[in-house]
């Protein structure tokens, strides 16, 4: 069984998101993204910024889905 990471905030998640950022990250700061493992207790989209920070976001937020679509298209 996959154990959840000890990262308890929206920043620097190693495996799972426990909380989500409350701020919309400017699109130009985002370099990449990945989805957290389905075994995590909560779903999460992790955006990686150009400065190398990883930020947990809520997949149900429209801006998150818009960014994902934009990155898939480009």
């Amino acid at each position: 069984t996959k154990t959840e990471s000890s990262s308890r905030g929206p920043y620097h998640p190693s495996e799972c998101c426990f909380t989500y950022t409350t701020y919309k990250i400017p699109r130009q700061r985002i370099m990449d993204y990945y989805e957290t493992n389905s075994q995590c207790s909560k779903p999460g989209i992790v955006f990686i910024t150009k400065r190398g920070h990883s930020v947990c976001t809520n997949p149900s937020d429209k801006w998150v889905q818009d960014y994902i679509k934009d990155m898939k298209e480009n």
Partner: antibody
Framework: CQSVKESEGGLFKPADTLTLTCTVS????????INWVRQAPGEGLEYIGW???????YYASWAKSRSTITRNTDENTATLKMTSLTAADTATYFC???????????????WGQGTLVTVSS | AVVLTQTASPVSAPVGGTVTVKCQAS??????LAWYQQKQGQPPKLLIY???KLASGVPSRFKGSGSGTEYTLTIRGVECADAATYSC????????FGGGTEVVVK
């Protein structure tokens, strides 16, 4: 006119598998998300899961081990499959659609009438 | 997980009066709160989102307010048609609904 409608529920036995279909009219699933929510008799609303406008499904923590949400964009339908039913799954099941107009896809302004699912031996 | 605790049912008000329904979250939800109205045998109807913004087509006598962990739905100039169950929903964290508050119009 935009609307969603759930398929007929009915009577199920414990350990059965439930399959419900949400048929969408007046909009495309390619630009809408579908949420599944249920309501036990006399109780509050309970979120089950949702499928995004790009087709990714997400689930409530309690539901993810036995629920699957899929969609068919050609037929404009979304399907909820829930396995290992128990009496506690007796509820009215709703599908609800949203295009993110309210900043979050969990906020739904288009709801079906709901369909009653009864689990009993 | 967030727990939403609503005003106990029933809440009654005379026609033309004011009704207040409260929703308390167990942790801060940053105004990510919606209110729904549900009548017997019908699906929920979205009234308020982002704690205070009126959904499309909802009369202005419905007002949402609050922040942090405390949120309120106020109905001014109550009409008979407002008799229903009102539920709050948090969408900051895990998409949890409150248990609902029944409003009775006398």
């Amino acid at each position: 006119c935009q609307s969603v409608k759930e398929s007929e529920g009915g009577l199920f036995k414990p350990a059965d598998t439930l399959t419900l279909t949400c048929t969408v009219s007046g909009f495309s699933l390619s630009s809408f998300a579908i949420n599944w929510v249920r309501q036990a008799p006399g109780e509050g609303l309970e979120y089950i899961g949702w499928i995004s406008d790009v087709g990714t499904a997400y689930y409530a923590s309690w539901a993810k081990s036995r629920s699957t949400i899929t969609r068919n964009t050609d037929e404009n339908t979304a399907t909820l499959k829930m396995t290992s039913l128990t009496a506690a799954d007796t509820a009215t099941y709703f599908c609800a659609g949203g295009d993110g107009s309210y900043s979050n896809y969990w906020v739904s302004d288009i709801w079906g009438q709901g369909t009653l699912v009864t689990v009993s031996s | 997980a967030v727990v939403l605790t609503q005003t106990a049912s029933p809440v009654s008000a005379p026609v033309g009066g004011t009704v207040t329904v409260k929703c308390q979250a167990s942790q801060t939800i940053n105004n990510r709160l919606a209110w729904y109205q549900q009548k017997q045998g019908q699906p929920p109807k979205l009234l308020i989102y982002e704690a205070s913004k009126l959904a499309s087509g909802v009369p202005s006598r419905f007002k949402g307010s609050g922040s942090g962990t405390e949120y309120t739905l106020t109905i001014r100039g109550v009409e008979c048609a407002d008799a229903a169950t009102y539920s709050c929903q948090e969408y900051a964290d895990e998409n949890i609904f409150g248990g609902g508050t029944e409003v009775v119009v006398k």
